[in-house]
Interface confidence: medium
Amino acid sequence: MNGSEYFVKIQSFLGGAPTEDLKALSQQNVSMDLATFMKLRTDAVLPLTVAEVQKLLGPHVEGLKAEERHRPVRDWILRQRQDDLDTLGLGLQGGIPNGYLVLDLSMQEALSGTPCLLGP
């Protein structure tokens, strides 16, 4: 079974995937297609690092550029450091500016929907 067939087989299960399971899959030899990735719960995708998303998508990571204005990719980009996004070489913009400190305050996020940033 090739990677595409593999994810067609399992994508119906993935919509409700918790972050922990996505992290586990990122540690294994998978290449999730973008259509499947876009169906994931936003709250499950947000905690994933750039490296984890890169490993989860494998060669399909290039497709993030085309989806950068759509959820969950848009919201995920907003949570990443720009210098981490730059390592993908895809020209993704909108990450946390280099030098800013992220305060992971749940109340702040609940009010504003975005992380609280402190300037350099």
């Epitope: 593999y6 399992i10 994508q11 299960f13 899959l25 294994q28 030899n29 905690p47 984890e52």
Partner: antibody, heavy 116, light 111 residues
Framework: EVKFEESGGGLVQPGGSMKLSCVAS????????MNWVRQSPEKGLEWVAQ??????????HYAESVKGRFSISRDDSKSSVYLQMNNLRAEDTGIYYC???????WGQGTTLTVSS | DIVLTQSPASLALSPGKRATISCRAS??????????IHWFQQKPGQPPKLLIY???NLETGVPARFSGSGSRTDFTLTIDPVEEDDVAIYYC?????????FGGGTKLEIK
């Protein structure tokens, strides 16, 4: 090419301590969970400990048989993972392997013998 | 803990025959539809080598004589045809739940 260099095994008395090291190369070490797995004739292959990523605050997990005695750590700047073993018992004797992710690559193993 | 029961404990086959090794899990090893069972080959004096990941995916560089099948709790490693070089112990591993657990191993001998 993925490579591991394990060290630190040897003979130790019951109740003693030992620290194993594993230096990895050939992949982006900081992106992967690392594990220690041991093997003995009595117990076969036995997963021992796991350490996750910086983004997971280096979360650790242990087999029940080693909880409170063993401690796994990593130094991403050195592409290294360690296993500090205290209060060693005879049943800890075996070959200790470091492995990456879900076992895609393994080191050659280092032998620990706990005996008086 | 998830218990993996392998059978048979050993088997001896002539070259060209088919080897079938079973691994039964005490509960489902599926992560959102992905069966996280993996098969390893271990030859004397060597570390285990990954053959099959996610129940049925052939690791790069592993001969197509090796295949994996099954889902949820029942899995099979098949070697067809068996060759002299396949003499080894074969193990299954589940990475669904901590603690990760291995099967007891199946020793393959060639007649």
């Amino acid at each position: 090419e993925v490579k591991f260099e394990e060290s630190g095994g040897g003979l130790v008395q019951p109740g003693g301590s030992m620290k194993l090291s594993c230096v990895a190369s050939g992949f982006t070490f900081s992106n992967y969970w690392m594990n220690w797995v041991r093997q003995s004739p009595e117990k076969g292959l036995e997963w021992v400990a796991q350490i996750r990523l910086k983004s997971d605050n280096y979360a650790t997990h242990y087999a029940e048989s080693v909880k409170g005695r063993f401690s796994i750590s990593r130094d991403d700047s050195k592409s290294s993972v360690y296993l500090q073993m205290n209060n060693l018992r005879a049943e800890d004797t075996g070959i200790y392997y470091c492995s990456v992710g879900t076992g895609g690559y393994w080191g050659q193993g280092t032998t620990l013998t706990v005996s008086s | 803990d998830i218990v993996l029961t392998q059978s048979p404990a050993s088997l001896a086959l002539s070259p060209g025959k088919r080897a079938t090794i079973s691994c039964r899990a005490s509960e489902s090893v599926s992560i959102i539809g992905t069966d996280v069972i993996h098969w390893f080959q271990q030859k004397p004096g060597q570390p285990p080598k990954l053959l099959i990941y996610h129940a049925s995916n052939l690791e790069t560089g592993v001969p197509a004589r090796f295949s994996g099948s099954g889902s949820r709790t029942d899995f099979t490693l098949t070697i067809d045809p068996v060759e002299e070089d396949d003499v080894a112990i074969y193990y299954c591993l589940q990475s669904r739940k901590i603690p990760w657990t291995f099967g007891g191993g199946t020793k393959l001998e060639i007649k």
